[in-house]
């Protein structure tokens, strides 16, 4: 498997419609919680919680502040922490508690605290519970949490120094935690937690399970340096701890190694960055997508592996355990345990079989089972990815977060669309296409290239968005920018399962699964653009330039996978001559303009898709070069800003089916005024201008017209 290619399209922040939310002097918007039924997005930031309209996050509905007192700040600073940054209250837990309240925890100047937020009044109840074990002390420390039936399961550090890791359940009747022992947790960096509900039709009275994902220092591999290992661990929701052994400790805590590697190249991805659990009506068992980087990542490598949850469950239910053995100089080595395994199976949830044997609760489990799981929390078998290889490996990028959406293309094929954020504020959208990865697009979510700290996907049909949180704010982006593809070819070549070309409206439209009639829409996930209707017209942009100047003709080909070439009249231009130059690989520069340069210029693009090359005419320009005797006083000119040039004449364009959108204005770099020529007729056409173009000093003038294209294939 090769490295993933560059994104086909790069959308700059200003090019697409992104909705933003940020409040002055508020930072670290890292906790996001979506209430789909209320269309509300809850945002936990530093010292504040906000409620915003999930359909338009710039609309703030409520806000509440949870600041640290000066006294607490001072005490924190005395312990050597920064008063300006660390000794504040970073919201780290934002979980639903009931229909009317949220459970919120913050670092609270290194004295973690939790409270209940009433959603009606949007005020804290002032419970000020101790957040130890639920929320980290240090805002820089890792954490994860999930609320399951009113009980908070969390993975974080339990002390000021962050040296005691803990996976715990905060419960009034049965609080549980991990053993503070290296075999259980060895300097973990917590990434994600989620509950997997038992299957409703499960015959064996199974229990719900809570899964934790983290990276920790390996106990089983000993090298000169510390080897990091990605882990999946799970506990049973019904666990009540042991009666004597493992009292108030998990009796069901088991962990296994997650494998994500490229065997052919020896590339091992062993640092877990994020996890997303994909649940879909078509999936019997959830699939989880995990995002990794290698431990020594000097080249910026990232990988995504996908796993069937059943594979992990198989390891925990039937896999071999590891055990530690002491070798010379009291050195501990972990090896596969091949001895007898007590019954009931250590670490197993209480199911019908256990109940039939009179083990109705973990409190009834025999000491042998409990002692075994206490000493053998690590499985020898590893959890391997689907197809035994990564779904995606990308070079020169550090991915930070992942969300995945399962969607159906027009032909019924199901695609898992991966939305992966980067440490430079961008979002990549990728799919697997015929055993290769296609990165549909890259969107610059944050203008100042800051890391994306959290990603959230809305699952409501119709209005679908991705929400991204960073240090400076939250950005809301649609799942696709279909409308930005101006031609049928562009729409098809995007190979975006969310988009299809609508011939009646000559637009690229978003496919919403709820809207049924898709008749007549064109979508070819193979990228075969020959299915597109022939273009009968193409718009020409006309320009008048001063003799001796320089012209830049725009070619607005957005695809990073396309190459362009230019034609003048019937000849193909090479931009390596003294006469021509290429600007940004796409735009044509024509130097030292003379009358001989007047005529029709076309920019054609070629894009290879699966050993097929798609050619299309992207831009057409009619250039008229005039010798200017003297300046002319110009009437008032309507001026608009256009991307790519500072000023341009305003031109009204009637769009034609399948035609390229008019390219942005071409700006003359020569100085001097321009006289209006007498009704120019562009080469090869009798089409005359229908509008009068005003002229202004320092600017060439232009207009748009339509010419029949005789040789489109």
């Amino acid at each position: 498997m090769a490295f993933a290619p560059i994104p086909r399209i790069t959308w700059e922040h200003r090019e697409v419609h992104l909705v933003q939310f940020h409040e002055p002097d508020i930072y670290n918007y890292s906790a996001l919680l979506l209430s789909e039924d209320k269309d509300t997005l809850y945002i936990g930031a530093r010292e504040a919680v906000f409620a915003v309209n999930a359909l338009n996050i710039s609309e703030k509905q409520h806000e509440v502040y949870w600041k640290v007192s000066e006294d607490k700040k001072a005490k924190c600073a005395e312990k050597g922490k920064s008063k300006q940054t660390e000794c504040l209250n970073y919201i780290r837990v934002l979980q639903p508690l009931s229909a009317t309240s949220l459970y919120v925890c913050g670092t609270n100047a290194f004295q973690p605290a939790c409270d209940h937020l009433n959603l009606t009044s949007f005020k804290f109840l002032g419970k000020n519970e101790d957040g130890k074990g639920r929320c980290p002390f240090d805002p820089a420390h890792s954490y994860t949490s999930v609320m399951v039936d009113g009980e908070l399961y969390s993975g974080t550090s339990y002390n000021f120094l962050g040296s005691e890791p803990i996976i715990s359940r905060n419960s009034s009747h049965s609080p549980l935690r991990t053993e503070y022992a290296i075999p259980w947790l060895n300097e973990p960096s917590f990434v994600f937690a989620d509950v997997i509900r038992k299957s409703p039709d499960s015959p064996d009275g199974e229990d719900d399970r809570v899964y934790f994902f983290f990276t920790e220092v390996s106990v089983e591999y000993e090298f000169v340096f510390r080897v990091l290992i990605p882990r999946i661990a799970r506990v049973c929701k019904g666990d009540q701890g042991g009666l004597r052994t493992l009292q108030k400790k998990w009796t069901s805590f088991l962990k296994a190694r997650l494998i994500c590697s490229r065997p052919d190249s020896g590339l091992v991805f062993n640092v877990l960055r994020d996890v997303f659990v994909l649940r879909s009506p078509g999936l019997k068992v959830p699939v989880f997508y995990a995002l990794f980087t290698p431990q020594l990542n000097n080249v910026g490598l990232s990988a995504v592996c996908a796993y069937n949850l059943s594979t992990a469950e198989e390891v925990f239910s039937h896999g071999k355990y590891m055990q530690s053995t002491t070798v010379e100089q009291s050195h501990t080595k972990w090896v596969r345990y091949n001895g007898p395994v007590p019954k009931p199976r250590p670490g197993a949830c209480i199911d019908s079989e256990a109940r039939a044997a009179n083990y109705t609760s973990s409190l009834n489990l025999p000491d042998k089972t409990l002692q075994f799981v206490k000493d053998h929390p690590l499985m020898d078998d590893s959890v391997t990815p689907i197809d035994n290889r990564p779904r995606l490996i990308k070079k020169d990028v550090n991915y930070t977060q992942i969300v995945v959406d399962r969607t159906q293309a027009l032909d019924g094929t199901v695609y898992d669309v991966m939305f992966v954020s980067t440490d430079r504020g961008a979002l990549h959208k990728a799919i697997s296409l015929e055993h290769a990865v296609h990165i549909i697009e890259e969107t610059q979510l944050f203008q100042d290239f800051e890391p994306v700290q959290t990603l959230l996907l809305s699952s409501k049909k119709g209005n679908r968005f991705v929400y991204a949180g960073s240090n400076s704010g939250v950005v809301q982006a649609p799942l696709a920018f279909c409308g930005k593809h101006g031609t049928c070819e562009d729409c098809v070549l995007a190979r975006d399962p969310y988009c299809a070309w609508s011939p009646p409206t000559a637009t690229c439209v978003a496919l919403h699964q709820t809207e049924s009639p898709s008749r007549g829409l064109i979508q070819e996930m193979s990228g075969d653009a020959s299915v597109c209707p022939d273009k009968s017209k193409g718009s020409y942009r006309q320009h008048f330039f001063k003799h001796g100047g320089t012209a830049e003709l725009k070619c607005s080909q957005k695809s990073n996978l396309a190459r362009v070439f230019w034609k003048f009249q019937n000849g193909v231009l090479k931009a390596e001559s003294p006469k021509y130059g290429l600007m940004g690989r796409k735009n044509l520069l024509i130097f030292n303009l003379s009358e001989g340069d007047s005529g029709v210029y076309q920019c054609l693009s070629e894009e290879r898709v699966k050993n097929k090359t798609v050619f299309q005419v992207v831009a057409k320009h009619v250039l008229e070069v005039k010798v200017v005797p003297k300046p002319v006083v110009a009437p008032t000119l309507s001026v608009v800003q256009t991307e790519g040039s500072r000023i341009a004449t305003k031109v009204l364009v009637a769009s034609t089916q399948g035609s390229s959108p008019p390219t942005p204005a071409v700006q003359a770099t020569s100085s001097g005024a321009i006289t209006l020529p007498p009704k120019p007729a562009p080469t090869g056409t009798s089409c005359e201008p229908k509008i009068v173009i005003n002229t202004v000093p320092q600017l060439h003038s232009e207009k748009t017209m339509y010419l029949k294209s005789s040789d489109n294939r």
Epitope: P5, V564, K567, V572, E606, T613
Partner: antibody, heavy 119, light 111 residues
């Protein structure tokens, strides 16, 4: 001045593999595809495939799929072609040639690398 | 694959005379008015050299006595007044689809 400098001639045994290099200079390496072309003694030219150095995308002639592997090292502006499981049929001169677009043709060629497969 | 058939296979021309080489494609190599056919010259022990690109465009540094024409499936390379140094094998090549293919070559000898 644009130059494509290929590695020297090689003599290999049947079943072995060979890796030919093509070092580009005088232009921006990532702006042009690199093509590889085979010319058997006294015969015409056969296109093996090409690679886009910008993103590593490759396209192969079906006839050479599984036989040839094209790679690039952007840091040294060098393109490589590895030929595996060599037989006497693979004895030929192999050229690298750049192209800036399908409309431009292959405007600069390496001097060629002679590969002889013999036991 | 697109098959390119060159004719004649060899050609003997007198100095100063005109030489015409034909190349026929098994399917059209033209799109949007662009004809994706190129011509190369190869001398013994040397790599091919690009003469004409996109059917009729003279490559920089190539003498003006070389010209190309044609569209769709039929293309021609002309050497208007043959010189001694033009003795070589000439190949046509299409780039409208993969695999790129070459003609069988035409050997030009000077009489």
């Amino acid at each position: 001045e644009v130059q494509l400098q290929q590695s020297g001639p090689v003599l290999v045994k049947p079943g072995a593999s060979v890796k030919i290099s093509c070092k580009a200079s005088g232009y921006t390496f990532t702006d042009y595809y690199m093509n590889w072309v085979k010319q058997s003694h006294g015969k015409s030219l056969e296109w093996i495939g090409d690679i886009n150095p910008d993103n590593g995308f490759t396209s192969y002639n079906q006839k050479f799929k599984g036989k040839a592997t094209l790679t690039v090292d952007r840091s040294s502006s060098t393109a490589y072609m590895e030929f595996r499981s060599l037989t006497s049929e693979d004895s030929a001169v192999y050229y690298c040639a750049r192209d800036g677009s399908s409309a431009y043709g292959m405007d600069y060629w390496g001097q060629g690398t002679s590969v002889t497969v013999s036991s | 694959d697109i098959v390119l058939t060159q004719s004649p296979a060899s050609l003997a021309v007198s100095l100063g005379q005109r030489a015409t080489i034909s190349c026929r494609a098994s399917e059209s190599v033209s799109i949007h008015g662009t004809h994706l056919m190129h011509w190369y010259q190869q001398k013994p022990g040397q790599p091919p050299k690009l003469l004409i690109y996109a059917a009729s465009n003279l490559e920089s540094g190539v003498p003006a006595r070389f010209s190309g024409s044609g569209s769709e499936t039929d293309f021609t390379l002309n050497i208007h007044t043959v010189e001694e140094e033009d003795a070589a094998t000439y190949f046509c090549q299409q780039s409208i689809e993969e695999p790129r293919t070459f003609g069988g070559g035409t050997k030009v000898e000077i009489k």
